[in-house]
Amino acid sequence: APVPPGEDSKDVAAPHRQPLTSSERIDKQIRYILDGISALRKETCNKSNMCESSKEALAENNLNLPKMAEKDGCFQSGFNEETCLVKIITGLLEFEVYLEYLQNRFESSEEQARAVQMSTKVLIQFLQKKAKNLDAITTPDPTTNASLLTKLQAQNQWLQDMTTHLILRSFKEFLQSSLRALRQM
């Protein structure tokens, strides 16, 4: 697995650097997770032809993956820092069950899948420190998550490959939209 943010050789070699601000740490954390997703997608795409499937064909799945919409306050029109932050944290919390599902889906990138999961937990902590309105954040119900996980793991091989691909693609997109919004805060 890649080295977590702040521990790369560049940082070690430059002790005179200013410590990272909260925003820079969040930015770096998201970029680190995106690197992990990229590596996982590589393995997925090498294993199956899911990556060639059109968005329309893939849209007919029953996964309720978090997605950024204009009403969430993260887009430039109607941008609202607090609403957006709540959406990002809520979305990441909702993705956690899907990241758990990914844990047994990779052979050569098992460590990478774990790194993505753990780094996402750290990112959520960073963002929660930044948020003022923590009461507005709804945490997914553990029982619902457990039954969803069981259901996903019971799918046939083709559907599991499809689910893996969709989770990675949607998570990447959600993180990119989050990264863009957070840099405006």
Partner: antibody, heavy 122, light 107 residues
Framework: QVTLKESGPTLVKPTQTLTLTCTFS??????????VGWIRQPPGKALEWLAL???????HYSPSLKSRLTITKDTSKNQVVLTMTNMDPVDTATYYC??????????????WGQGTLVTVSS | DIVMTQSPATLSVTPGDRVSLSCRAS??????LHWYQQKSHESPRLLIK???QSISGIPSRFSGSGSGSDFTLSINSVEPEDVGVYYC?????????FGAGTKLELK
């Protein structure tokens, strides 16, 4: 390979609305991380960023021109359209469309069109 | 808005010279800094992305360095075809902003 091409009028009258179309190929504006934007350059002057539209339809505008600009995309036609209202002679410039594509959303403009010179005069 | 200040405005060089072009951001933009070259009557082209990342097809004599708010574009041995205007760009946050450019000319 990636190409972008601007089209639209070369001459517009003051107060009129300018509509420019960017037609591109070699990439899709439905791919996450992709954005297409507009930049202009008055004769002999520096580059000025105008607007950018993302794969997910988020739109960003230059604050000084926001009230006059609208950017839209037609993913199926591989086109991005910029409209600029209430044109003035100071808007005379070469208008470029360009692409940004990056996992980290660095907003580096890696491919540019050839540009189209728009003159505003009565 | 993040203001990008480039210096010098004009640089007169002799082929073979090593030159440095400076770009300063009005606030920290981390590594979200890009360099473009624009030759006379041509569209700009991306030279360096994210401070120091090289771009396919760009000669290796071009390199970038810096971090935070101070950045440098270096040309290690200027060729006559390098004549043109060089722009730096803030890619951190909106509005995206360009510097006023540094004009590179031959003595």
């Amino acid at each position: 390979q990636v190409t972008l091409k601007e089209s639209g009028p070369t001459l517009v009258k003051p107060t009129q609305t300018l509509t420019l179309t960017c037609t591109f190929s070699g990439f899709s504006l439905s791919t996450s991380g992709v954005a297409v934007g507009w930049i202009r350059q008055p004769p002999g002057k520096a580059l000025e960023w105008l607007a950018l539209i993302f794969w997910d339809d988020d739109k960003h505008y230059s604050p000084s021109l926001k009230s006059r600009l609208t950017i839209t995309k037609d993913t199926s036609k591989n086109q991005v359209v910029l409209t600029m209202t209430n044109m003035d002679p100071v808007d005379t410039a070469t208008y470029y469309c360009a692409r940004s594509y990056d996992d980290y959303l660095y907003y580096a403009l890696d491919y540019w069109g050839q540009g189209t010179l728009v003159t505003v005069s009565s | 808005d993040i203001v990008m200040t480039q210096s010098p405005a004009t640089l007169s060089v002799t082929p073979g010279d090593r030159v440095s072009l400076s770009c300063r951001a009005s606030q920290s933009i981390s590594d979200y800094l890009h360099w473009y070259q624009q030759k006379s009557h041509e569209s700009p082209r991306l030279l360096i992305k994210s401070v120091s990342q090289s771009i396919s097809g760009i000669p290796s004599r071009f390199s970038g360095s810096g971090s935070g708010s101070d950045f440098t574009l270096s040309i290690n041995s200027v060729e006559p075809e390098d004549v043109g205007v060089y722009y730096c760009q803030n890619g951190h946050s909106f509005p995206l902003t360009f510097g006023a450019g540094t004009k590179l000319e031959l003595k």
